[in-house]
Amino acid sequence: HHHHHHASQPCPDPTAPPNGHISPVQATYVLKDSFSVFCKTGFELLQGSVPLKSFTAVCQKDGSWDRPIPECSIIDCGPPDDLPNGHVDYITGPEVTTYKAVIQYSCEETFYTMSSNGKYVCEADGFWTSSKGEKSLPVCKPVCGLSTHTSGGRIIGGQPAKPGDFPWQVLLLGETTAAGALIHDDWVLTAAHAVYGKTEAMSSLDIRMGILKRLSLIYTQAWPEAVFIHEGYTHGAGFDNDIALIKLKNKVTINRNIMPICLPRKEAASLMKTDFVGTVAGWGLTQKGFLARNLMFVDIPIVDHQKCATAYTKQPYPGAKVTVNMLCAGLDRGGKDSCRGDAGGALVFLDNETQRWFVGGIVSWGSINCGGSEQYGVYTKVTNYIPWIENIINNF
């Protein structure tokens, strides 16, 4: 061993970098001796600008170390990622992104909300981390069910909608005119019969939002990425399970004229009892027998399920019957109804507790004689399909 010391030169004493220490500390370092550098918490080993997890240098025969000592640099989490539909504020100081710096994410007020508090800290692993330990960005979820509409409007028997009344209303243009309801910033709820045959021919489906006038040249355009028709729906064999979802290629920006309708809460059933009033809007046929130019709406009461089923037994609709997956709305004497061209639109109700509107029904079918006495409008009962809707959205 003594000979081994003389055969090679000792290496110079290593100097610990600022905010770091060396181990082991020895009086001398000779051939094959090594040392490692460790940084204080909140600092990392950097060789230039490149991070290292560990550093060990070995003493060589010529009395030099085999690599240069890196620096211990303060952890820099870097500029935080942009938050879609939100923004970030630097709390610690302008553009400060180093260890223990704090930032605050916020969503665009009024139209988006965040479930967490949005506070993130630059931690020792170099990631912006929330108080719950999450390293992913918070999510700005669209607010749903806000409307300037107040119940009491007297598109059969209806009246014109005003801007912001039905911001979830979606116009579907294909071979025929239909409607849908925005339920997320990239999902539209509609009737299966309105999009039947569109699962493959999606490019023929023109989706428009943020409009009142059906023929308006100023609108927000969306295109379908996928169409999901309920597996229990059979085209031409009644309207049971008449529900579908359209996944949009791109998220739409939420504003006062484009906003999702809320899905019903578990308590929604108590708000949709017989004689409770819902509202439906659409560009479908009016009393005059033509498609409406302006978005029309009507407030209509829910009809007793048995009464509705009986009415359609007396005056059957070819190939259709009222099932438990449907709800009916209208007046015994008639005069208020949805009609052809309204299909897929939402029958909505105000949740008094949250003061938000939610979708209870989807315009599905009814007598050819829209608004006729005891010819109630039949709607897909959305509360029966919440698991189906959530399953598709969550698994897409």
Partner: antibody, heavy 114, light 107 residues
């Protein structure tokens, strides 16, 4: 012996996305170092695109920041390059390499053409 | 971005000669410079890191020197297999940048 191997399509159309995989054998990508993507244009100009470090942190060339994403799958010991909205200017040989550049893949040639 | 300038695009030398390839950084990069050798049809191979530290397996006829802005790769006793293009790279500051390359031809 440590090796890096790039894989991906040889041809991509303009405006599409490019996805490349670097499979590392003989060394765990979580053990240490930064794992880089570097490309070499016709004429031999080299450009560093970005890296993903042992901890999963990324650093990108600002000239590509809006289009690039580097991710990894630690269970497969792979890291990935995604480059969006490619143009003919992205035609190059793409290499994955370990810092200090002591190990490089053999490169994969990408042509962007309609 | 830091610009790494290799002013000599092509250098001619003979077997057994000593040749120096230079690289200039547009700003101070300390010793955070690497040198690569690329032979035709091959991927680059690391020769030197941190300005003067030889990578393992690299013949000791390759020597790196310099700090700050001026760096040199010296090949003493040039061999025919050294016919290649040589690139410098700074890793001091992101983005990491490369020189444009110097081709070495053997007379």
């Amino acid at each position: 012996q440590m090796q890096l191997q790039e894989s991906g399509p040889g041809l991509v159309k303009p405006s599409q996305s490019l996805s490349l995989t670097c499979t590392v054998t003989g060394y765990s990508i979580t053990s240490d170092y930064a794992w880089n993507w570097i490309r070499q244009f016709p004429g031999n100009k080299l450009e560093w695109m970005g890296y993903i470090s042992y901890s999963g942190r990324t650093s990108y060339n600002p000239s590509l920041k809006s289009r690039i994403s580097i991710t990894r799958d630690t269970s497969k010991n792979q890291f990935f390059l995604q480059l969006n909205s490619v143009t003919t200017e992205d035609t190059a040989t793409y290499y994955c390499a370990r810092h200090y550049g002591d190990y490089w893949g053999q490169g994969t040639t990408l042509t962007v053409s309609s | 971005d830091i610009v790494m300038t290799q002013s000599q695009k092509l250098m001619s030398t003979s077997v057994g000669d000593r040749v120096s390839v230079t690289c200039k950084a547009s700003q101070n990069v300390g010793t955070n410079v690497a040198w690569y050798q690329q032979k035709p049809g091959q991927s680059p191979k690391a020769l030197i890191y941190s300005a003067s530290y030889r990578n393992s397996g690299v013949p000791d006829r390759f020597t790196g020197s310099g700090s700050g802005t001026d760096f040199t790769l010296t090949i003493s006793n040039v061999q025919s297999e050294d016919l290649a293009e040589y690139f410098c790279q700074q890793f001091n500051t992101n983005p990491l940048t490369f020189g444009s390359g110097t081709k070495l031809e053997i007379k």
